[in-house]
Interface confidence: medium
């Protein structure tokens, strides 16, 4: 029986019964989060031979080997992967060996075997026989091989039963468990699989076969399975499906998406039966089974039943996620909110076309409309009373519409209306008229020159910085004293600053009027002496951090068309000095010989600069008596040391010798310090570990059903 679309067995080990009749799992297999140790010996699934996606095992208490569960699992195809991996074994507390002695092929993807404190028989498996490339395999934090004492069948009796291969210049026997060898096919078979009796399978077989050179006797297919036969490509009028079998059009038309109950059914594209058109393609009509290329980004049409969609919160904006065409009218009324600009961009940033009108009113939280970053066409098929298709009324903090240097917006029909937007300069509105092609449509009262921009510095001069000085947590800057036509018009300056890892910030980035302005603001009074340049000391900054800074002059009276004349600087990027790092993290120590300790730690969370070296101090402690209480000749009685808890892979440490013999009588000396590249690699490794663990947790922890 083909099972799927992915089987998730969690919490209750008896759910394993769902695998009873499965020969192929079309999809993934998760076995996870079974916290009560159970006896798995009565569970055996000899029918299961293929998993088309991946196998994930995570925190299954009491499970000591996979060999009894899946004695005939031969192929994991890796058609879809779990974070680049086709086999993941993570935090399996009791697993002693993998034991998948019939596993012959992982077609795509790597393996990740991590933090399994009791897991042995890892160094005895030659993964290169199973995977095409082993370089991406990640096997760390398991039981150290020195404590495992892995013995392949027959080696104790000096009648070794398993074959040898070379891994990392080590020629050794290859096995899965103490009584199961790793199967290898004769070299005469080349890349082909073989039977249990070492006869070569048909070239289209994968993993194994029940009879030699027979494409109907394969355990799994190298390419595709069709009507009981392994074929190199799907026959005419059949289509690839789920990466492993061929189906006909009738099958594809009738199958029901396992993931989405409201999808439009499967499609046929490029010889494949798939759930949705691939990226860059769209269905050729809503009931069509075929795909055509999109022109530009693929459209997603969203429609509002009531014609007008009111955006008054992040929740209401969420409904528009992914929409490129909005059929209807948009009424934006954002009075408050947290981090509103970036949230709106996230949910509305793909909208390109609005078929009706756009009305923005009482949106005191908005500083800019740049969150509609792809809007290029307002059709104006429906208009407000007075024939308005773009209406902006009473937005107390709106300062920018869009960045017109990088924006092409057309309003096909209807007029624009602007009133009571005190911080929106009329020049900005006039610029919009030109860009959108609405110039000449508006009548005199449609753009109110009195109450738009009445509280903004609309004609700006440029302020120039004159000096900058930095320390580890301070920046001192000064700038030219601004001289408006009437000196009494100048009230003060406002300095804006924020952390800026990259030199790509703009004044309105992530800015709204509800405190989610990502800029910090400091007011600077005018120096009493007219000849002294204004300046400020910014303190409480982070060491070795790049900041963006700009300054605005705050001016008073109405001049030139009743508008304030103001001034502001360009954005300046400046880095603070380095400082003392925070303490190193996760210090661990272990002994790898009678005269050596290996100490391992992670870099500090706040390096505060480029780290150049560490200082390690140590002192002698009294000997621990428990070390004498064990018989080290008895394999089973070796105590698990503190570092075999799935948190440190000691082999990783001992691979590189820590001492080397120096010339003459010098004796041993310290290993060379790590290069920058090595340090960077370690940093990336630690980051990668965290990212994977986060991905794992985010993928598998789901809310309990109601």
């Amino acid at each position: 029986e083909i099972c799927g679309p992915g089987i998730d067995i969690r919490n209750d080990y008896q759910q394993l019964k769902r695998l009873e009749n499965c020969t192929v799992i079309e999809g993934y297999l998760h076995i996870l989060l079974i916290s009560k140790a159970e006896d798995y010996r009565s569970y055996r699934f000899p029918k299961l031979t293929v998993i088309t996606e991946y196998l994930l095992l995570f925190r299954v208490a009491g499970l000591e080997s996979l060999g009894d569960l899946f004695p005939n699992l031969t192929v994991i195809r890796g058609w879809k992967l779990f974070y680049n991996y086709a086999l993941v074994i993570f935090e399996m507390t009791n697993l002693k060996d993998i034991g998948l002695y019939n596993l012959r092929n992982i077609t795509r993807g790597a393996i990740r075997i991590e933090k399994n404190a009791d897991l042995c028989y890892l160094s005895t498996v030659d993964w290169s026989l199973i995977l095409d490339a082993v370089s991406n395999n990640y096997i760390v934090g398991n039981k150290p091989p020195k404590e495992c004492g892995d013995l392949c069948p027959g080696t104790m009796e000096e009648k070794p039963m398993c074959e040898k291969t070379t891994i990392n210049n080590e020629y050794n026997y290859r096995c899965w468990t103490t009584n199961r060898c790793q199967k290898m096919c004769p070299s005469t078979c080349g890349k082909r699989a073989c039977t249990e009796n070492n006869e070569c399978c048909h070239p289209e077989c994968l993993g194994s076969c029940s009879a030699p050179d027979n494409d109907t006797a394969c355990v799994a297919c190298r390419h595709y399975y069709y009507a009981g036969v392994c074929v190199p490509a799907c026959p005419p009028n059949t289509y690839r499906f789920e990466g492993w079998r061929c189906v006909d059009r009738d099958f594809c038309a009738n199958i029901l998406s396992a993931e989405s109950s409201d999808s439009e059914g499967f499609v046929i594209h490029d010889g494949e039966c798939m759930q949705e058109c691939p990226s860059g393609f769209i269905r050729n009509g809503s009931q069509s089974m075929y795909c055509i290329p999109c022109e530009g980004p693929c459209p997603k049409v969203c429609e509002e039943e009531k014609k007008t969609k009111t955006i008054d919160s992040v929740t209401s904006a969420q409904m528009l996620q992914g929409c490129t065409i909005f059929k209807g009218n948009l009424l934006i009324n954002i009075r408050r909110g947290n981090n509103i600009a970036s949230e709106l961009e996230n949910f509305m940033g793909l909208i390109e076309v609005v078929t009706g009108y756009v009305k923005i009113r009482h949106s005191h939280a908005l500083v800019s409309l740049s969150f509609l970053k792809n809007l290029r066409l307002i059709l104006g098929e429906e208009q407000l009373e007075g024939n308005y298709s773009f209406y902006v009324l009473d937005n107390q903090n709106l300062q920018q519409l869009w960045d017109w240097d990088h924006r092409n917006l057309t309003i096909k029909a209807g007029k624009m209306y602007f009133a009571f937007n005190p911080k929106l300069c009329v020049s900005e509105i006039y610029r919009m008229e030109e860009v959108t092609g609405t110039k000449g449509r508006q009548s005199k009262g449609d753009i109110n020159t009195r109450n738009n921009g009445e509280r903004a510095s609309c004609e700006s001069d440029v302020l120039h910085f004159t000096s900058t000085t930095t320390s580890k947590n301070r920046i001192i800057i000064t700038w030219h004293r601004y001289r408006p036509p009437d000196y009494r018009d100048l009230i003060s300056f406002t300095v804006y600053y924020k952390e800026a890892p990259f030199k790509n910030v703009t004044e309105y980035d992530g800015q709204d009027a509800c405190g989610s302005n990502s800029w910090n603001m400091v007011d600077v009074d005018l120096p009493p002496n007219k000849d002294v340049e204004p300046g400020i000391l910014l303190h409480g900054l982070k060491p070795w951090t790049q900041y963006a800074v700009y300054v605005k002059a705050v001016t008073l009276t109405m001049v030139e068309n009743d508008h304030i004349r103001g001034a502001k600087s360009e954005i300046l990027y400046i880095r603070t000095n380095a400082s003392v790092p925070s303490i190193p993290l996760d210090v661990l120590s272990a002994s790898n010989s009678s005269s050596q300790l290996i100490v391992k730690w992670n870099p500090p969370s706040l390096p505060n600069g480029n780290l150049s070296y560490y200082i390690v101090r140590w002192q002698r402690q009294p000997q621990d008596g428990y070390l004498y209480r064990h018989n080290y000749c008895s394999k089973d009685k070796i105590p698990i040391r503190k570092y075999a808890d799935g948190t440190i892979d000691i082999e990783e440490v001992t691979e590189n010798p820590k001492t080397e013999v120096c010339g003459g009588e010098k004796g041993p000396c310290c290993a060379c310090p790590k290069t920058e590249a090595e340090k960077q690699a370690e940093k990336e490794e630690a980051e990668y570990r965290k990212v994977f663990e986060n991905f794992l947790h985010n993928s598998i922890f789901v809310p309990r059903p109601e």
Epitope: I2, P5, T23, E26, A227, V247, D250, F251, A258, S261
Partner: antibody, heavy 116, light 107 residues
Framework: QIQLVQSGPELKKPGETVKISCKAS????????LNWVKQAPGEGLKWMGW????????TYAEEFKGRFVFFLETSASTAYLQINNLSDEDTATYFC??????????????WGAGTS | DIQMTQTTSSLSASLGDKVTISCRAS??????LNWYQQKPDGTIKLLIY???RLHSGIPSRFSGSGSGTDYSLTISNLEQEDIATYFC?????????FGGGTKVEIK
């Protein structure tokens, strides 16, 4: 076109054996599951089980274990239902019906005309 | 086994009427509910699968709805050719089971 053609009506005595055939045409038999459904006179439909046309493995509903046998003649694109040791309760129309080898598609989209 | 109950064994309606047939499962069947039509000559065909999806070639006057344990089939505009017995079937848990059927006749 796609169809399942069933053999004609049968008249049997209690204790005898009957073999009903279901021939697939217009599609490849091995790509779809083949189900058997019973309808006693004046009654509803009862699913008897199915045969995996890839492997030949039958699955029987509890009530139909024992005397009922599903098997295939793949070369002739034909599935068979054999009932041994017939009794009066076996008087019914037997339908073959096609299902898809796909976990979320638990329905029968092509039916034979039935054999009584 | 999951029991499927069609409470109305037969109903009479006029041509052009809207007809609704209901079906109840003994437990939640997660929308895996299918509808079949059996004509007086005994031929059976699939109308709707997965609660509301119209099988190819079936007229749009047929529609399905429901969730959990309660489901229904609606014929929006009854035609002469719709005279038949309608069966529901659950596809949630083996063995698949059918309802007893609802016979639709013309008044």
């Amino acid at each position: 076109q796609i169809q399942l053609v069933q053999s004609g009506p049968e008249l049997k005595k209690p204790g005898e054996t009957v073999k009903i055939s279901c021939k697939a045409s217009g599609y490849n038999l091995a790509n779809y599951g083949l189900n058997w459904v019973k309808q006693a006179p004046g009654e509803g439909l009862k699913w008897m089980g199915w045969i995996n046309t890839n492997t030949g493995a039958p699955t029987y509903a509890e009530e139909f274990k024992g005397r009922f046998v599903f098997f295939l003649e793949t070369s002739a694109s034909t599935a068979y239902l054999q009932i041994n040791n017939l009794s009066d309760e076996d008087t019914a129309t037997y339908f073959c019906a096609r299902s898809i080898y796909y976990y979320a598609s638990r329905y029968f989209n092509v039916w034979g005309a039935g054999t009584s | 086994d999951i029991q499927m109950t069609q409470t109305t064994s037969s109903l009479s309606a006029s041509l052009g009427d809207k007809v609704t047939i209901s079906c109840r499962a003994s437990q939640d069947i997660s929308n895996y509910l299918n509808w079949y039509q059996q004509k007086p000559d005994g031929t059976i065909k699939l109308l709707i699968y997965y609660t509301s999806r119209l099988h190819s070639g079936i007229p749009s006057r047929f529609s399905g709805s429901g969730s959990g344990t309660d489901y229904s089939l609606t014929i929006s505009n009854l035609e002469q050719e719709d005279i038949a017995t309608y069966f529901c079937q659950q596809g949630n848990t083996l063995p698949w089971t059918f309802g007893g059927g609802t016979k639709v006749e013309i008044k």
